[in-house]
Interface confidence: low
């Protein structure tokens, strides 16, 4: 469902690299001219997730079955139990915590895998490569298991997974296959277990962009079971903007406004834009182009 | 109808603790973000921050950060509001504040308020 | 942080008459402005939402305009029951601010 979003995502990378744009996500349709400076809770680090649908909240269903079921916390980020209902619902949803947290959860990077060359590495290295849905593009390496090589693509700056590597050198040392193969102790000093962070503990540069809104903000548009086609708007996380949709009547998602505004006023404020101390990067519509140093590299942020 | 029920007054000394709550009736409890609203005397009025009660997410003021903690009773519908080490700047009244729509954030419902006061 | 200015601190009318209090925000904020009323010793009451949208059960008198920095609440023709401090309130950024409020009191 939502790995659909893929080539968006890259079609989206490669605009932003030809046109030479690092694109503000915060940049709702044009007739909204305001400036948005979110701060929240900001204890714990930049939460990534190993998959897009763990930032689901969960959803019991319509049906009427009481049945015992786990999903991911974006708030504790901590798996939980929830009631099922027995249909429908979303992805965020397990059988079993053991489940959950496999698929959730940081903690279960810290599991060894054994390839068939009998050489050790984590689970994260098999991962695809994975933008995320943020725009903030950055360079940032990731294994490919197809080449067995570290190779570099442009992240997104939010969300993504764990094959994420800041470095060349570093993604080399966590998942290539190095000359006396994988050492579980250069992994154990690379990665905090402790934190859900779900970034190499060496990458030292946090998210250039972070969504702290109501996670349905981040599902896609989701038509239903119905045969209606009623007009509704969804927000759409990969540009930033409020869309049209239509919907079946029944089902789908929480990202169903019955107006533009409504959908603007519940997702739009969620995105904030990070510098490397922890300082916030105001965007300002009005300006044409903004330039913003940040302590690893000078990038422009424009407006699209 | 839509009501939002608030603990009675309370006279505290300074570097004590006092939890506020606040009980709603007449919709889904956890459907909506529950805001925290403080007003001293004489003054206007200050976010201190939410909280989702489906989920227990918060969101303060960084103003208020560390100094007021927000948690949720689902079972009794109850929302509340521990503050802490207080001193007489934190005599005031506070509102526990429903939101009209999700995440809209203008305050369409308002309890009748704590009146909190720290002496000594 | 959005600082919300209001203007003027005090206004003194006469039933009947007409009257509008002003609230500045220091940046843009398009129109994510609410207005409130509240009496002596009571709790604060949403008047207008979203600079210009009316409130059920609000008096028709009320009424609020404005977009950008510039907002303005009117009363087209006050009545005693009017008399209270009146706060705007912007929700186009966190953390949430109020403005420093408007006493309306009778000449």
């Known amino acids: 469902m939502i790995y659909t979003m893929k080539k968006v995502h890259a079609l989206w990378a490669s605009v932003c690299l030809l046109l030479n744009l690092a694109p503000a996500p915060l940049n709702a349709d044009s007739e909204e001219d305001e400036e948005h400076t979110i701060i929240t809770d900001t204890e714990l680090p930049p939460l990534k997730l190993m998959h897009s649908f763990c930032a689901f909240k969960a959803d019991d269903g319509p049906c009427k079955a009481i049945m015992k079921r786990f999903f991911f916390n974006i708030f504790t980020r901590q798996c939980e139990e929830f009631i099922y209902g027995g249909c429908e619902g979303n992805q965020n949803r397990f059988e079993s915590l053991e489940e959950c947290k496999k698929m959730c959860t940081r903690d279960n990077a810290n599991r060894i895998i054994k390839t068939t060359l009998q050489q050790e590495k984590p689970d994260f290295c098999f991962l695809e490569e994975d933008p995320g849905i943020c725009r903030g593009y950055i360079t940032r390496y990731f294994y490919n298991n197809q080449t067995k090589q570290c190779e570099r693509f442009k992240y997104g700056g939010c969300l993504g997974n764990m094959n994420n590597f800041e470095t060349l050198e570093e993604c080399k040392n966590i998942c290539e296959d190095g000359p006396n193969g994988f050492q579980v102790d250069n992994y154990g000093t690379q990665l905090n277990a402790v934190n859900n962070s779900l970034t190499p503990q060496s990458t030292k540069v946090p998210s250039l962009f972070e969504f702290h809104g109501p996670s349905w903000c981040l599902t896609p548009a989701d038509r239903g079971l119905c045969r209606a086609n009623e007009n509704r708007f969804y927000y759409n996380s990969v540009i930033g903007k409020c869309r049209p949709f239509k919907y079946s009547g029944c089902g789908g998602n929480e990202n169903n406004f019955t107006s533009k505004q409504e959908c603007l006023r519940a997702c739009k404020k969620g995105f904030i834009q990070r510098i490397s101390k922890g300082g916030l990067i105001k965007t300002k519509r009005k300006r044409k182009k903004q330039r913003v140093k940040i302590a690893y590299e000078e990038i422009f942020v424009k407006n699209m | 109808e839509i009501q939002l029920q608030q603990s009675g007054p309370e006279l505290v000394k300074p570097g004590a603790s006092v939890k506020v709550s606040c009980k709603a009736s007449?919709?889904?409890?956890?459907?909506?973000?529950m805001y925290w609203v403080k007003q001293s005397h004489g003054k206007s009025l200050e976010w201190i921050g939410y909280?989702?009660?489906?989920?227990?997410?918060?969101s303060y003021n960084q103003k208020f950060k560390g100094e007021a903690t927000l948690t949720v009773d689902k079972s009794s519908s109850t929302a509340f509001m521990h503050l802490n080490s207080l001193t007489s700047e934190d005599s005031a009244v506070y509102y526990c504040?429903?939101?009209?729509?999700?995440?809209?954030?203008?305050?369409?419902?308002w309890g009748q308020g704590t009146l909190v006061t720290v002496s000594a | 942080d959005i600082l919300l200015t209001q203007s003027p601190a005090i206004l003194s009318v006469s039933p009947g008459e007409r009257v509008s209090f002003s609230c500045r925000a220091s940046?843009?904020?398009?129109?994510?402005i609410h207005w409130y009323q509240q009496r002596t010793n009571g709790s604060p009451r949403l008047l207008i939402k979203?600079?210009?949208e009316s409130i059920s059960g609000i008096p028709s008198r009320f009424s609020g305009s404005g977009s950008g920095t510039d907002f303005t609440l009117s009363i087209n023709s006050v009545e005693s029951e009017d008399i209270a401090d009146y706060y705007c309130?912007?929700?186009?950024?966190?953390?949430?601010?109020f403005g420093a409020g408007t006493k309306l009191e009778l000449k």
């Open positions: 504040v429903r939101e009209g729509n999700r995440y809209d954030e203008r305050f369409t419902y």
């Open positions: 007449g919709y889904s409890f956890t459907d909506y973000n």
């Open positions: 909280i989702d009660p489906y989920s227990g997410g918060t």
């Open positions: 940046q843009s904020i398009g129109t994510s």
């Open positions: 979203y600079a210009s």
């Open positions: 309130q912007q929700s186009s950024s966190w953390p949430l601010t």
